[in-house]
């Protein structure tokens, strides 16, 4: 018996110690979001265990005070979705004593109308403004620095129009140090963790993005007033490019922001000569007037692998050679505006074009190919180590188009016992239908049957291997009862069969000699019990008149026992 797995909050995460009573779930939110509800839930014991509180949610609050602000993020309510109307949100950021703040503009997208973002160099609504969205056409790529330890951020929205709002990153830094750099859609490595003068930082972009503006390497200079010698670069998904990596990503221009209208972009992807390319189109959300074309070669004269417009779900393409050309043309007239409108294409170098791509090993399992070369028709079987079970298809086949018939399976830890099954001549009581660890099954035999084995089985976890029942399923055997002692035949009569002991359930039959009639039951049964006993007293044979004799005979015949019984041959 266990609690259900708690729901992961959007823009947050949950960690669970155990799903059994006493177990706990801890929730936390991504930077910029605040937890609404209980941070910590406990699984309570009951016939059906339950969490002691509702799962919390992560919300972007409208304002707040962030004291001891070291690094973090403030986002407008609803971000990355749209904010609502008639908001006035104030955030106060306060760096630790002796430190100052730097603000990076991750995103600012305000509705045209009267929505406004003001950042003030101080701790209140009347502090001097140092950024005002009304006035500033372009976001300062170098961000903003506080001259003291505070920034006051003010977002106000009017009654019409809405947009994604804002996401601001803040970093506190010490006197004599530079602030922590930031690059959206990228990463950096630093020669020292606190960025004193002399620190160098090297930037790189996430796959699919290109470094633009600024420098790849920047240095913290000027001991009197430490600052970066160059502005941080930006990582942007650009229109067109030549890629010679064995794996990578091609993104629509500006992804995940919307691409522009009237674009004509061409990407060339080139891998090793004796290889080919697998294109995994993971996102394709373009307008009906936009066209994405894949050419099986290194220019636009090559064979068209596929041409697509409008939205389409996940699919894959394979080239026949080591080059592919991707062309994207967006409609000059209309644009599909919206976050994550565009495409995301992952590409991989795969072996030559008479084999399916190499399949990876899977954690906690192994694979067995039917033959070493992954040619058309090859079957690969995946199996899991003890304690794990295959999720998905365990058998994959290399198809005629050199793609695998199924997606890669995975080995999932087995967290329940198999169904121990029904036992003949019994009914069972189960504590939980899927038999998780801790579940019990109780067997109860039908009347007249006795239990051989354990009546209650419990599902136990094991260090190695799958969970196991505490015992084998029992059996319900017919009760072994004492026999009835034989009854003597009545005077002037006979009994059949003539045994000393009669097993429980057996029947004996009585008959009388000619001229005598039976008084009592002609057949009696050995009734099972402790002890077993006869169903009726034995009958007697009484002398009869001639009329009576004949009547009794006809009666005797009319009352003949069933064929299975045996009558005394004296009749």
């Amino acid at each position: 018996l266990s609690c259900h797995f708690p729901r992961r909050p959007a823009y947050g995460d949950v960690t669970v110690t155990s799903l059994h009573p006493g177990g706990s779930a801890r929730f936390h939110c991504a930077t910029g979001y605040q937890l609404k509800g209980a941070r910590h839930l406990t699984c309570l014991n009951a016939t059906q265990p339950f969490w002691d509180s509702k799962e919390p949610v992560c919300i972007a609050a409208c304002g707040g005070v962030i004291r001891n602000a070291t690094t973090g993020r403030i986002v407008s309510p609803g971000f990355p979705g749209n904010y609502s109307n008639n908001l006035t949100c104030h955030w106060l950021l306060e760096a630790p004593e002796g430190q100052r703040l730097h603000l990076h503009f991750e995103k600012v997208s305000l509705a045209e109308d009267d929505d406004r973002l003001i950042i003030r160099n101080g701790d209140n609504v009347e502090a001097p403004p140092v950024y005002d969205s009304y006035e500033v056409e372009y976001l300062p790529i170098e961000g903003l620095l506080s001259s003291g330890k505070h920034f006051f951020v003010e977002l106000s929205t009017d009654s019409s129009g809405a947009a994604a709002g804002m996401a601001l990153r803040y970093e506190a830094f010490q006197q004599g140090h530079c602030y922590e750099p930031f690059v959206k859609y990228g990463n950096f490595s630093s020669s020292t963790p606190t960025y004193p003068v002399g620190t160098t930082v090297e930037f790189s972009c996430d796959p699919g993005y290109t470094l633009e503006q600024g420098s790849i390497i920047i240095e913290c200079v000027d001991p009197h007033d430490p600052q970066w010698n160059e502005t941080e670069p930006a990582c942007r998904a650009v229109c067109s490019g030549e890629i010679t990596d064995s794996a990578g990503v091609v993104l629509s221009p500006n992804w995940p922001e919307p691409y522009g209208r009237g674009q004509d972009c061409i990407w060339g992807v080139h891998v090793e000569e004796d290889k080919r390319i697998m294109l995994d189109i993971r996102v394709l959300r373009i307008g009906p007037g936009d066209v994405l074309t894949f050419y099986d070669g290194d220019d636009l004269t090559a064979r068209v692998l596929g041409q697509y417009s409008g939205p389409r779900s996940h699919f894959k393409l394979f080239t026949s050679m080591a080059d592919v050309t991707i062309q994207f043309q967006s409609d000059p007239g209309t644009s599909v505006l919206g976050y994550q409108q565009g495409f995301v294409i992952h590409f991989f170098e795969v072996p030559r074009n008479d084999t399916c791509p190499e399949l990876p090993e899977i954690p906690n399992g192994w694979k067995s190919p039917s033959q070493p070369e992954l040619v058309h028709g090859t079957v690969v079987t995946y199996q899991c180590y003890p304690g794990y079970q295959v999720v998905g298809s365990s058998v994959l086949m290399c198809q005629w188009d050199l793609t695998w018939s199924e997606d890669l399976p995975s080995c999932q830890r087995v967290t329940s016992c198999h169904d121990p099954g029904d036992v003949e001549h019994s009914r069972r009581l189960i504590s939980s239908p899927k038999f998780p660890v801790g579940a019990t099954v109780q067997y109860i035999c039908d009347q007249g049957f006795v239990l051989m084995g354990s009546s209650i089985l419990t599902c136990h976890d094991r260090q190695a291997g799958s969970p196991k029942w505490s015992d084998r399923a029992p059996k319900c055997l017919l009760e072994q009862l004492k026999p009835c002692h034989g009854l003597s035949a009545p005077e002037n009569g006979a009994r059949s069969p003539e045994k000393q002991l009669h097993p429980a359930g057996a029947t004996i039959h009585f008959s009388c000699a000619p001229g005598y009639v039976l008084k009592g039951q002609a057949s009696i049964k050995c009734v099972p019990g402790h002890p077993s006993h006869w169903s009726d007293p034995p009958p007697i044979c009484r002398a009869a008149s001639l009329d009576g004799f004949y009547n009794s005979r006809s009666l005797d015949v009319a009352k003949a026992p069933a064929a299975s019984s045996t009558l005394d041959a004296a009749h």
């Epitope: 100052r100 009267d114 406004r116 160099n121 101080g122 009347e126 502090a127 001097p128 403004p129 140092v130 950024y131 005002d132 009304y134 006035e135 500033v136 300062p140 903003l144 620095l145 506080s146 001259s147 003291g148 007033d225």
Partner: antibody, heavy 116, light 107 residues
Framework: QVQLQQSGAELARPGASVKMSCKAS????????MHWVKQRPGQGLEWIGY????????KYNQKVKDKATLTADKSSSTAYMQLSSLTSEDSAVYYC?????????WGQGTTLTVSS | DIQMTQSPSSLSASLGERVSLTCRAS??????LSWLQQTPDGTIKRLIY???TLHSGVPKRFSGSRSGSDYSLTISSLESEDFAGYYC?????????FGGGTKLEIK
Amino acid sequence: QVQLQQSGAELARPGASVKMSCKASGYTFTSYTMHWVKQRPGQGLEWIGYINPRSDYTKYNQKVKDKATLTADKSSSTAYMQLSSLTSEDSAVYYCARGGLGLDYWGQGTTLTVSS
Amino acid sequence: DIQMTQSPSSLSASLGERVSLTCRASQEISGYLSWLQQTPDGTIKRLIYAASTLHSGVPKRFSGSRSGSDYSLTISSLESEDFAGYYCLQYASYPYTFGGGTKLEIK
């Protein structure tokens, strides 16, 4: 386009008071603070203070705190500065400036002459 | 209060010449500095804000830069209408303070 139209030149006696105006147009008056700046003949610029027309909150330079009083009339989008107990030291050109980043738009100035 | 020290106080230059004016802040102003131009008739215009951002409509021959606590205004090639007074203004904290001004005269 943003315009700040200031009232005409003033001549005043020592000890008197004057009230000059600055009429804003081309933007939402309550969306920006209005600052006032003094420039004595042949001298540099000195910040007097500002008013937030939305809340009527005012902030003054401590050096001129008791000299100037800033007010605003939302209905006419006009800011006012009253100078009291005038002395010859108050003879100067007074500018109003919109409180954008680093005072983005300026009025043409009002000349005040204090003379007996 | 933050003191803004502006230099030179006056400067003679010829048409087409490149000139630079400097302001130094007595305290940290984090780049919150604007440059203003005052023409002989008293009109004041903002040229640059945030140390280096050009106000809309201002010719590209004007540029601003920062090096530590020193801020500069550069006019790459002087034109006749550029002969005027120039002031720096810090707007990092109240009270706002101005540099003493530079009078740029034609040689």
